[in-house]
Interface confidence: low
Amino acid sequence: FKVATPYSLYVCPEGQNVTLTCRLLGPVDKGHDVTFYKTWYRSSRGEVQTCSERRPIRNLTFQDLHLHHGGHQAANTSHDLAQRHGLESASDHHGNFSITMRNLTLLDSGLYCCLVVEIRHHHSEHRVHGAMELQVQTGKDAPSNCVVYPSSSQDSENITAA
């Protein structure tokens, strides 16, 4: 399987909410001994390997934000801890999983990584990640709503997030 990031860049005004999204692609085993661990964390640019550094999102580690379930199952973080920090990660039946960040501030700007690990008998068989950038803007140049930019370089048209 692979992880796709539909959008590589999210540009949002301060105070807005944003949902960063990744999508699980390809065949997914549904055996009883196979589960998927999905999570989110921040990283930094200029690394040899993107997403190798794991930083917290609003002081919450990837541990705090993880989802752990079988194949294309729906799940979401029930942690009060995450919600107190204005965060919620979720996963649907179609392989999409996301993190929603509420009331954005300039400090939220940076590189975000989604991580998916396929686990068989508690052993990590396959680990993939996706990366995207969030830019939070303030002032007269800031957009009125979040604007997202598709990952494909052929897509030149901006898509406004709902």
Partner: antibody, heavy 121, light 106 residues
Framework: EVQLVESGGGLVKPGGSLRLSCAAS????????MNWVRQAPGKGLEWVSS????????YYADSVKGRFTISRDNAKNSLYLQMNSLRAEDTAVYYC??????????????WGQGTTVTVSS | DIQMTQSPSSLSASVGDRVTITCQAS??????LNWYQQKPGKAPKLLIY???NLETGVPSRFSGSGSGTDFTFTISSLQPEDIATYYC????????FGGGTKVEIK
């Protein structure tokens, strides 16, 4: 402050039992897999057992399989190691350690100070 | 079980020296290898994970490299506070530690 504190060690005769406890604080205990690692006097580190965050997955080293039982109580932020049929070679400092779960962990990043178990007649 | 062979078992070096420790796995473990530092009477401390990634807060004089079966841990410039025993540890899938390398100052 992220902290692990072990207790329950002591002197026990061969064939006896002990229950070690590890109290966790300063982090969301229920999100992490946990381990017991031991170190015999003057020797190296030996992994003993691990338990996943929700107790779904439990593993033991061959040297303790069938004699030791790992468990946890997430409501109490506590990890346990029940040690039965103790042998002289189980004499060691026992550490509990937090496993950074990826979910395949990339290391044990927080350790307790250790509790000493001595098995001797 | 995967065996980890660490060498040397002990070494003595001067302050400022470059120190290298090797660890060999009995079979391919990809990059599933960590390095720990243990000072006398203290609990181990994670220094490097996934063979080459420095744990947060660890000085940059520590580094790791390797993949497969052969791994290297390096202290680029030995400091007095680096006196300790260093352990490699694999996790593919269950943990085993190397025998340790005791580092002393000449």
């Amino acid at each position: 402050e992220v902290q692990l504190v072990e207790s329950g060690g002591g002197l026990v005769k061969p064939g006896g039992s002990l229950r070690l406890s590890c109290a966790a604080s300063g982090f969301t205990f229920s999100s992490y897999s946990m381990n017991w690692v031991r170190q015999a006097p003057g020797k190296g580190l030996e992994w003993v057992s691990s338990i996943s965050s929700s107790s779904s997955y439990i593993y033991y080293a061959d040297s303790v399989k069938g004699r030791f039982t790992i468990s946890r109580d997430n409501a109490k932020n506590s990890l346990y190691l029940q040690m039965n049929s103790l042998r002289a070679e189980d004499t060691a400092v026992y550490y509990c350690a937090r496993e950074v779960y990826d979910p395949h962990y990339y290391g044990m990043d927080v350790w307790g100070q250790g509790t000493t178990v001595t098995v001797s007649s | 079980d995967i065996q980890m062979t660490q060498s040397p078992s002990s070494l003595s070096a001067s302050v400022g020296d470059r120190v290298t420790i090797t660890c060999q796995a009995s079979q391919d473990i990809s990059n599933y290898l960590n390095w720990y530092q243990q000072k006398p009477g203290k609990a181990p401390k994670l220094l490097i994970y996934d063979a080459s990634n420095l744990e947060t807060g660890v000085p940059s004089r520590f580094s790791g490299s390797g993949s497969g079966t052969d791994f290297t841990f390096t202290i680029s410039s030995l400091q007095p506070e680096d006196i300790a025993t260093y352990y490699c540890q694999q996790y593919n899938p269950l943990p085993t530690f190397g025998g340790g390398t005791k580092v002393e100052i000449k």
